[in-house]
Interface confidence: medium
Amino acid sequence: APTSSSTKKTQLQLEHLLLDLQMILNGINNYKNPKLTRMLTFKFYMPKKATELKHLQCLEEELKPLEEVLNLAQSKNFHLRPRDLISNINVIVLELKGSETTFMCEYADETATIVEFLNRWITFCQSIISTLT
């Protein structure tokens, strides 16, 4: 059974992930971002189900495409380089889901824009955090 300290650690990691995802969303939604229209043409795979930490496997597989889109933006709205930003997210995701997970991600039939994708995972983080508090 999870201890109170491990639950707290998980909660902090989820909050960190949530902030990183929100930072990306805020950066690309900035009204001064001239490349938003082009960024919205990129398609992302959405998880069929995202209710448990193991489902973060679906986010992990989409981190490389996410970084590619952020490289396209070359936005001054981010304090970190895309590589560093996504690398930070990757570290958190690996710790949360476990690096040796055998879960096989299933994706929904419909793809999504980067905004929809980020909102989905932001909602996921908020949902899990609410169950821990």
Epitope: L63, K64, R83, D84, S87, M104
Partner: antibody
């Protein structure tokens, strides 16, 4: 022990096709991204193509884009490289390699390689 | 033309220290991507020597070490031995390239 076994190499004519297979064992196959790396005779290593654990995302080097297709069947623990419109410059040993993770990992396991020769 | 530049060859006497450089640019090593090193002994399959976090797989002696600074990386081999004679490749990622994976052209190490 991680094992990767390639097959399907051989002689093909320019413009012809070949399909390479790579069977993986000793690890949870679907949890790993896989790539194909080739080495022309007496030359260095060249990354060819990659595919994520689910198979939803595929990546290609410019030199093979539109001609090669990577795919995988996780129920059979196998990854494939369909090579069409082959050229003489595609002649090489093709290695199947396992990535350490989905996100910009390193190639931690290599197969023995299969030789593809494109010649008329 | 590879996005990562390595010297074609280096050499050293047994017991010496040699370094192999891997020079990139702001779109690969300089962008923060890790650099990985592989060793290929003549007639054999390449094998991972050092990963981007500086870790060595089991069986790789601690005589091998990697470092990175700015847009360059280097592999250092101390206490050179005859069995170290091989080709060495650096590998990273480049967001300007399709697929983004990139290898250096390789460096032939000769033990004198």
């Amino acid at each position: 022990e991680v094992q990767l076994l390639e097959s399907g190499g051989g002689l093909a004519q320019p413009g012809g096709s070949l399909r390479l297979s790579c069977a993986g064992s000793g690890f949870t196959f679907s949890s790993y991204a896989m790539s194909w790396v080739r080495q022309a005779p007496g030359k260095g290593l060249e990354w060819v193509s990659g595919i994520t654990g689910t198979g939803y995302r595929t990546y290609y080097a410019d030199s093979v884009k539109g001609r090669f297709t990577v795919s995988r069947d996780n129920s059979r623990n196998t990854v494939y490289l369909q090579m069409n419109s082959l050229r003489a410059e595609d002649t090489a040993v093709y290695y199947c390699v396992r990535e350490s993770g989905h996100y910009y990992g390193w190639f931690d396991s290599w197969g023995q390689g299969t030789l593809v020769t494109v010649s008329s | 033309q590879s996005a990562l530049t390595q010297p074609p060859s280096v050499s050293g006497a047994p017991g010496q220290r040699v370094t192999i450089s891997c020079t990139g640019s702001s779109s690969n090593i300089g962008a923060g991507y890790n650099v990985h090193w592989y060793q290929q002994v003549p007639g054999t399959v390449p094998k991972l020597l050092i990963d981007g976090k500086g870790n060595r797989p089991s069986g790789v002696p601690d005589r091998f070490s990697g470092s990175k600074s700015g847009t360059s990386a280097s592999l250092a081999i101390t206490g050179l031995q005859a069995e170290d004679e091989a080709d060495y490749y650096c590998q990273s990622y480049d967001y300007m390239l399709s697929g983004s994976v990139v290898f250096g052209r390789g460096t032939k190490l000769t033990v004198l």
